[in-house]
Interface confidence: low
């Protein structure tokens, strides 16, 4: 990766001597890119979602490396300066979780609770066991919602 | 995983002309500067040639000892690098490199000028 | 152009030991705070392989045993401990201006 520093020079040129000038990115204005800043660097371009920087932005100037996530594994789901994919989630079945859309290079694990498990929170990191109701249903557990029992001595419909 | 192969190295003629082909792969080529680096036998590493991407208006750039002689190329459709060669001479022969700018390096290929 | 002067040109080191070759530029190789200067370990019949970059940092799969360390115009590349596998040519390399510059090279050799 090829970058050069001069106090005189703010932009990418060819000097007198022909040798490359970079410039270095100071603001920003692109919204939603991750991993904009590193160590005090901005790099120039970013890397299409599914790829990462295959090093850091210091080394990379405004040409970036890209190599692709590890499939199943990593993802980055835009475009972004990070050397880092993000690593794909787990669906902990211990929490009640299984696997509803696999993880692709542009896209995280999509979750759901398993079969007799329901999560009413919006972003559901555990399920819970739908209640076993002893004197009869009111209403069935969904996804979302744990069953509703009977209570003791009401009378059925 | 990045793959840079490198062909189109021979036995040529001093003053003749030849053309080396870089084949690369595992990542995306045509946002990326790309090299040439040149490592005569037994000797050291020497860069030869860049290109940039066409953001950048494939500039490119050569060692003092080609320029003039030497040409520099790129596909990006078909991800392959370029190294037109003319007017060669002995001190040319070498092992020659393709080079991303994240320093990955292919194989190389064989130049031997020699009549 | 930025001349890089490595040493020494060779080096014989005992298995276990440290081994540490240097790296002079005729002027800075600093960018914006971080110096562009990358080492290489190249074997016969082998392209060169990247070690270091920036300096300090060890690229993925290298091992710990080699760490690299400078800025500015001093730069050297750390090995220990030496193992068999380390008998090698080592470059350094700067990439803050065209042309790109590579060290002579050292050779390393086991005592």
């Known amino acids: 990766r090829l970058s050069s520093k001069s106090v005189n020079a703010q932009v990418t040129d060819i000097n007198s001597k022909g040798l490359e000038l970079r410039k270095t990115v100071t603001t920003v204005e692109t919204q939603n890119l991750e991993g904009l800043h590193h160590d005090g660097q901005f790099c120039h371009k970013p890397c299409p979602p599914g790829e990462r920087k295959a090093r850091d932005c210091t080394v990379n100037g405004d040409e970036p490396d890209c190599v692709p996530c590890q499939e199943g594994k990593e993802y980055t789901d835009k475009a972004h300066f990070s050397s880092k994919c993000r690593r794909c989630r787990l669906c902990d079945e211990g929490h009640g979780l299984e696997v509803e859309i696999n993880c692709t290079r542009t896209q995280n694990t999509k979750c759901r609770c398993k079969p007799n498990f329901f999560c009413n929170s919006t972003v559901c990191e555990h399920c819970d066991p739908c209640t076993k109701c002893e004197h009869g249903i009111i209403k069935e557990c969904t996804l979302t919602s744990n069953t509703k029992c009977k209570e003791e001595g009401s009378r059925s419909n | 995983e990045v793959q840079l192969v490198e062909t189109g190295g021979g036995l040529v003629q001093p003053k003749g002309s030849l053309k080396l082909s870089c084949a690369a792969s595992?990542?995306?080529?045509?946002?990326?500067?790309m090299n040439w680096v040149r490592q005569a036998p037994g000797k050291g590493l020497e860069w030869v040639a860049r290109?940039?991407?066409?953001?950048?208006?494939?500039?490119?750039y050569y060692a003092e000892s080609v320029k003039d002689r030497f040409t520099i190329s790129r596909d990006d459709s078909q991800s392959m690098l370029y190294l037109q060669m003319n007017n060669l001479k002995a001190e040319d022969t070498a092992m020659y490199y393709c080079?991303?700018?994240?320093?990955?390096w292919g194989q190389g290929t064989t130049l031997t000028v020699s009549s | 152009d930025i001349v890089l002067t490595q040493s020494p040109a060779s080096l014989a080191v005992s298995l276990g030991q440290r081994a540490t070759i240097s790296c002079r530029a005729s002027?800075?190789?600093?960018?914006?705070?971080?110096?562009?200067m990358q080492w290489y370990q190249q074997k016969p019949g082998q392209p060169p392989k990247l070690l270091i970059y920036?300096?300090?940092n060890v690229e993925s799969g290298v091992p710990a045993r080699f760490s690299g360390s400078g800025s500015g115009t001093d730069f050297s590349l750390n090995i220990h401990p030496v193992e068999e596998d380390d008998i090698a040519m080592y470059f350094c390399?700067?990439?803050?201006?065209?042309?790109?510059?590579f060290g002579g090279g050292t050779k390393l050799e086991i005592k």
């Open positions: 080079v991303t700018d994240g320093y990955y």
């Open positions: 595992g990542f995306t080529f045509n946002t990326n500067a």
């Open positions: 290109i940039r991407s066409k953001s950048n208006n494939y500039a490119t």
């Open positions: 002027e800075s190789v600093e960018y914006y705070g971080t110096s562009l």
């Open positions: 920036v300096a300090s």
């Open positions: 390399q700067q990439s803050t201006k065209v042309p790109w510059t």
